[in-house]
């Protein structure tokens, strides 16, 4: 793995310390030849959760074009999920022209959908 990246189960992970909007975080990872983290198992969930701590952190999951999609093409419907109860609620009340379209880890590790412009931390992943 590159310097400052963490290797785990044939992938490399980079954990941000600053905060960015989802699109900016997504772009950051792409410029590093990586993508926002795609969580495919409970074991990977626990690994990421251990490194990010109790801070809202973007992952590579969004529904900005309709259905929920992982940025690397991993199938959402059949894949691992760890939403908080009653999430995602894709709440349309905020008048942004869409719902809460981007997914993040919450303080307890479970997932929530939120306004994509929020300045949260993020995790990049690239496969070895």
């Amino acid at each position: 793995c590159p310097v400052n990246w963490v290797e785990h189960e044939r992938s490399c992970y980079w954990f941000s310390r600053s905060g960015k909007a989802w699109a900016d975080a997504d772009n950051y990872c792409r410029l590093e030849d990586a993508h926002l983290v795609v969580v495919t198992s409970w074991e990977e969930q626990k690994f990421v959760q251990h490194h990010i701590g109790p801070v809202n952190t973007w992952m590579g999951l969004h529904d900005q074009n309709g259905p929920w999609k992982w940025v690397d093409g991993t199938d959402y419907e059949t894949g691992f999920k760890n939403w908080r109860p009653e999430q995602p609620d894709d709440w349309y009340g905020h008048g942004l022209g869409g719902g809460e379209d981007c997914a993040h880890f919450t303080d307890d590790g479970r997932w929530n959908d939120d306004v994509c412009q929020r300045p949260y931390r993020w995790v990049c992943e690239t496969e070895l």
Epitope: G19, H94, R118
Partner: antibody, heavy 120, light 107 residues
Framework: QVQLVESGGGVVQPGRSLKLSCAAS????????MHWVRQAPGKGLEWVAV????????NYADSVKGRFTISRDNSKNTLCLQMNSLRAEDTAVYYC?????????????WGQGTTVTVSS | DIQMAQSPSSLSASVGDRVTITCRTS??????LAWFQQKPGKAPKSLLY???SLQGGVPSKFSGSGSGTDFTLTISSLQPEDFATYYC?????????FGGGTKVEIK
């Protein structure tokens, strides 16, 4: 009880520097983001800067970017604002305020403020 | 940056009146809006966050509503201690921005 006490204000000439401090007590300082907000005489509130709970993320208003630096010492429960190249328009009451969370959740508790006057 | 338009800039009201202050943002901010009260020579005091959630210790005569770009602060029955300046603030993203304030004066 939760308390924030600012200090370090005073009269300073344009172009000079000043360092403000904010002493926090009554809560676990290291788990909260902290902000500086200022208010020019007779004017409204202007957000200045934020630092996340662990010091890793800092953001500034465009009006102070490159001149002001926010910092914190979690071992001393202290927030600081280093102000360089001061201008007349920096004259204001400066408040430190606690974030409701790690740094992106809005403000809940405010200090009483310290006055900075930039004048020749 | 997100611009905050608060109205009215000032209003005169009597004790017991119902007062409504509005805040409009230049782009949608979800519910990431707070309201503050400031009295002359004093620090601001937080009243509401997430558009409608009361801060601890704040009386229920204060209420907030709205989402997206349009928000309101309502004081159901104005009391002498409520005469002050009120500010809205968005915290959806940096830089945080405040409205220009609404001064509530005694009629």
């Amino acid at each position: 009880q939760v308390q924030l006490v600012e200090s370090g204000g005073g009269v300073v000439q344009p172009g000079r520097s000043l360092k403000l401090s904010c002493a926090a007590s009554g809560f676990t300082f290291s788990t909260y983001g902290m902000h500086w907000v200022r208010q020019a005489p007779g004017k409204g509130l202007e957000w200045v800067a934020v630092i996340w709970y662990d010091g890793t993320n800092k953001n500034y208003a465009d009006s102070v970017k490159g001149r002001f630096t926010i910092s914190r010492d979690n071992s001393k429960n202290t927030l600081c604002l280093q102000m360089n190249s001061l201008r007349a328009e920096d004259t204001a009451v400066y408040y430190c305020a606690r974030d409701q969370g790690v740094g992106y959740d809005g403000l809940d508790v405010w200090g009483q403020g310290t006055t900075v006057t930039v004048s020749s | 940056d997100i611009q905050m338009a608060q109205s009215p800039s000032s209003l005169s009201a009597s004790v017991g009146d119902r007062v409504t202050i509005t805040c409009r943002t230049s782009q949608g901010i979800g519910k990431y809006l707070a309201w503050f009260q400031q009295k002359p020579g004093k620090a601001p005091k937080s009243l509401l966050y997430k558009a409608s959630s009361l801060q601890g210790g704040v009386p229920s005569k204060f209420s907030g509503s709205g989402s997206g770009t349009d928000f309101t602060l309502t004081i159901s029955s104005l009391q002498p201690e409520d005469f002050a300046t009120y500010y809205c603030q968005q915290y959806m993203t940096y830089p945080l921005t405040f409205g220009g304030g609404t001064k509530v004066e005694i009629k």
